[in-house]
Interface confidence: low
């Protein structure tokens, strides 16, 4: 009786169960009674990243320069080209199809990670006791100057996108 | 001063294809990303999508299959086509740009009501 | 995606009055908004971005601050002209998002 269902890896076709190709090859010619099914090996340009029974291999993804795309790493038999962005841009999706300029870290907010070809900048509000006084991609937060360890006092306090001011302590006699 | 004046038909019919277009002056699309939004009867504004300086493009997700934005270096102008349309795509298509974090979205288009009905 | 929720939705006021209009993002967007004005004939001009930066040509009446996550557009002092929609715009990330919008009428 011909089989309804096949196992992993197998397919059904003309009431047979046929093997699936591996992942790099492509499907010629079905099984038959007599014959194993028969697959060839991908060319170069292209892949195929699962067990299948397609007849076309899939073209490698091209990352674009004119785009700002890159090639992050080179496409193989069994896996597509994964592109990322040129620097001081990074993707606008996983799939990588665009690419935008990283964002700077407001006054106020200082670097927490710095942007690369698929991750954009990542700011965080200075906390009290630090500032930021520029927009940049680069700086982190920096501490309030210690107007003590200068033998100075603190004249005006500092905030989260300005230094405190020091000046010289009065001395009345 | 940069100026942006979107341009194509008030009224398509539905299940056809939108076709707006962007008129950059002042600057060039060449330079900066160029994007269309779109305000729906009511106060919802929708973002839909850039082209950059480049050519390269982003669409937001849920209109990813029908949209295509693409530009005219030569006539400065960029382009809007959203596919199979439906009531739902009645709205007013601004066009704007966007150049610096810093600065936001800095000039848009006076925009332009398609209405879809058959 | 990052959700604008902005209130109030509709408003009336008087000339000479201060507003407060307010924008939650539901996640951090790094100071990355914008508030635009919509008037009745339907042009769009941008008035504050990087959440508090005068963009210009705008008068000194409007002011944009943060707190954390939650965004705040001041009109210290209506105008006629002033009374119009007013959106919340995020470019922190995309796909840029915009709050529901304010409707700010005569009293």
């Known amino acids: 009786e011909p089989p309804t269902a096949c196992r992993e890896k197998q397919y059904l076709i003309n009431s047979q169960c046929c093997s699936l190709c591996q992942p790099g090859q492509k499907l010629v010619s079905d099984c038959t009674e007599f014959t194993e099914t028969e697959c060839l090996p991908c060319s170069e340009s292209e892949f195929l990243d699962t067990w299948n029974r397609e007849t076309r291999c899939h073209q490698h993804k091209y990352c674009d320069p004119n785009l700002g795309l890159q090639v992050q790493q080179k496409g193989t038999s069994e896996t597509d080209t994964i592109c990322t962005c040129e620097e001081g841009l990074h993707c606008t999706s996983e799939s990588c199809e665009s690419c935008v300029p990283h964002r700077s870290c407001l006054p106020g907010f200082g670097v927490k990670q710095i942007a690369t070809g698929v991750s954009d900048t990542i700011c965080e509000p200075c906390p009290v006791g630090f500032f930021s006084n520029v927009s940049s991609a680069f700086e982190k937060c920096r501490p309030w100057t210690s107007c003590e360890t200068k033998d100075l006092v603190v004249q005006q306090a500092g905030t989260n996108k300005t230094d405190v001011v020091c000046g010289p302590q009065d001395r009345q006699r | 001063e940069v100026q942006l004046q979107e341009s194509g038909p008030g009224l398509v019919k539905p299940s056809q294809t939108l076709s707006l277009t962007c008129t950059v002056s002042?600057?060039?699309?060449?330079?900066?990303?160029w994007n269309w939004i779109r305000k729906h009867p009511g106060k919802k504004l929708e973002y839909m999508g850039f082209?950059?300086?480049?050519?390269?493009?982003y669409y937001t997700p849920s209109l990813k299959s029908r949209i295509t934005i693409s530009r005219d270096t030569s006539k400065n102008q960029f382009s809007l086509k959203l596919s199979s349309v439906t009531a739902a795509d009645t709205a007013v298509y601004f066009c704007a740009r966007f150049r610096r974090y810093d600065d936001g979205v800095d000039y848009w288009g006076q925009g332009t009501l398609v209405t879809v009905s058959s | 995606d990052i959700q604008m929720t902005q209130s109030p939705s509709a408003m009336s006021a008087s000339v000479g009055d201060r507003v407060t209009i307010t924008c939650r993002a539901s996640?951090?967007?790094?100071?990355?908004l914008s508030w635009i004005q919509q008037k009745p004939g339907g042009t769009i001009k941008r008035l504050i971005n990087a959440a508090s930066t005068l963009a210009s040509g705008v008068p000194s009446r409007f002011s944009g601050s943060r707190s954390g996550t939650e965004f705040t557009l001041t009109i210290s002092s209506l105008q006629p002209e002033d009374f119009a929609d007013y959106y919340c715009l995020q470019y922190s990330s995309y796909p840029w998002t915009f709050g529901g919008g304010t409707k700010l009428e005569i009293k």
């Open positions: 002042g600057d060039s699309v060449s330079s900066g990303y």
């Open positions: 996640h951090e967007i790094s100071g990355y």
């Open positions: 082209i950059s300086y480049s050519g390269s493009t």
